[in-house]
């Protein structure tokens, strides 16, 4: 910017130096040269020369105006032609800015990941501003009355340290910047209630040799919660469609899950948990590659039909990726395709 | 630990004007986005005016062409002029000081009383 430049003049800028957006703008340029009766008065933005609606007001003033002024940022300056110089004089110049009133914040979520002694509260912030724009959370006891204000530019993590005397708030947040305010709906916290388990990860997948080969995948997570419902998800790598499994699981030790898939294929699996009978879910594990061993039989075994699949608490369903570049993003596009029942002799899958 | 102390407050006709001031001390001043809030009586805290750092400043609905926010950065001090005052901005005033992530800092308030 240009800020700093020292003037032989003025420049003033209606409605104001940060303006709504596509609205008109009026600039004017008032010149205090000594030595110089001005034959013109130029502005120029970002650098370039304008030539189009300049009125020159009186002898020491010129305006340029603008219709539906719409660039987030420019620089203005403006110049004098004095006679007698060979150059043009600066006057003087200021930064503009053009934005938005901020939209009322959205999905206002907040989470407590375990162990992280944080509460992290995060929302959709709408349309771009283009200026700055702050936002400030709000966190009010329901058994205290005390309210807690927070400053964020687009998240917040709030210790639970300073969320000791209660365990329900009201949390909601202000979006501000120099054109407006808007408020996020409230939401209604209890801090029981919004704890996500420590990431749970999968750490190695075997497949048997056995006359029906069978994939055992090996997951953990350092959760100390007791009840915890999870899914993980499979699918071949060149496949867009995803299998999801259900499970009840109980991490004082590594989870064990049985498989059934095609041979000679790369499987791709995923897993999340959340606390049993909660909303807020992990995000999906880090993409955990297996491949299966070569079919020595001639059988071709189909994952969803197979009745060697153990559905002990599980539900096998069918999900599709939007995007094979976005693994995370995924849509439920089923209902559950099946439930099944233990096949007689098999164990059962662990949690 | 930032501290914060405001004055200015007092007792005005409605249509008359007062200047408050907010100082602070032992912190980086710098760091704050720093702001007017006010608090009536059975009311919750709301926020009258804060500066971004772009310079431009936000003002509340019901105060906007009457009160002004300026600073003087060279005495860690910001000011709210306030104008054309009215009854219903009887209230106790803080200032408060905010930084990105963390909890936001009050004064001790100096109250405003308007009649009519």
């Known amino acids: 910017g240009i800020t700093s430049i020292n003037c032989s003049g003025d420049m003033w800028v209606e409605p104001g130096e940060i303006f709504q957006m596509g609205m008109n703008v009026s600039i004017y340029c008032q010149e205090a040269l000594k030595h110089c009766r001005p034959r013109n008065l130029y502005f120029y933005k970002n650098g370039f020369k304008e030539e189009f609606d300049i009125t020159r007001i009186n002898r020491t003033t010129a305006r340029i105006w603008y219709k539906g002024f719409s660039e987030p940022h420019a620089y203005m300056h403006c110049t004098a032609e004095c006679p007698g110089h060979f150059q043009e004089t600066l006057i003087c110049g200021k930064d503009i800015s053009s934005g938005h009133p901020p939209d009322a914040p959205s999905n206002l979520t907040c989470v407590i990941y375990e162990y992280s002694g944080n509460m992290t509260c995060t929302w959709n912030t709408g349309k771009p501003t283009y200026i700055d724009t702050k936002y400030i959370v709000h966190v009010k006891s329901l058994e205290t009355e005390e309210e807690q204000q927070y400053l964020a530019s687009s998240y917040v993590k709030i210790s639970t340290d300073s969320l000791q005397g209660s365990r329900k708030y009201l949390v909601w947040v202000q979006a501000v910047n120099s054109l407006g305010m808007e408020n996020s709906q409230q939401l209604h916290v209890h801090l029981d209630d919004i704890v996500i388990p420590s990431a749970s990860i999968i750490s190695r997948a075997e497949t048997t040799n056995d006359t029906v080969p069978k994939t055992i995948v090996y997951w953990k997570s350092k959760t100390m919660i007791e009840k915890v419902f999870c899914e993980m998800r499979y699918k071949t790598t060149t496949n867009q469609t995803w299998s999801v499994k259900e499970f009840d699981a109980n991490f004082t030790y590594v989870q064990q899950s049985e498989f059934y898939l095609e041979p000679d294929s790369k499987y791709v699996f995923q897993v999340r948990c959340q606390e049993t009978g909660k909303r807020n879910w992990q995000p999906w594990s880090s993409p955990f590659v297996h491949q299966t061993s070569q079919e020595t039989g001639k059988r071709n075994w189909q994952p969803w039909s197979s009745p060697f699949v153990h559905q002990t608490s599980q539900t096998v369903s069918q999900v599709t990726a939007k995007s094979s570049h976005e693994p995370q993003k995924m849509e439920m596009l089923s209902a559950t395709i099946f439930r099944g029942h233990p096949a007689s002799g098999n164990h059962q899958d662990i949690g | 630990q930032v501290q914060l102390q405001e004055s200015g407050g007092g007792s005005v006709q409605a249509g008359g004007s007062l200047r408050l001031s907010c100082t602070a001390s032992?912190?980086?001043?710098?760091?704050?986005?720093m702001g007017w809030y006010r608090q009536a009586p059975g009311k919750e805290r709301e926020l009258v005016s804060m500066?971004?750092?772009?310079?431009?400043?936000f003002y509340a609905d019901s105060v906007k062409g009457r009160f002004t926010f300026s600073q003087e950065n060279a005495k860690n001090t910001v000011y709210l002029q306030m104008n054309s005052l009215k009854p219903e901005d009887t209230a106790m005033y803080y200032c408060g000081c905010a930084t990105l992530g963390s909890r936001t800092i009050w004064g001790q308030g100096t109250q405003v009383t308007v009649s009519s």
């Open positions: 032992r912190y980086t001043y710098s760091s704050c986005t």
């Open positions: 500066v971004f750092s772009d310079g431009s400043t």
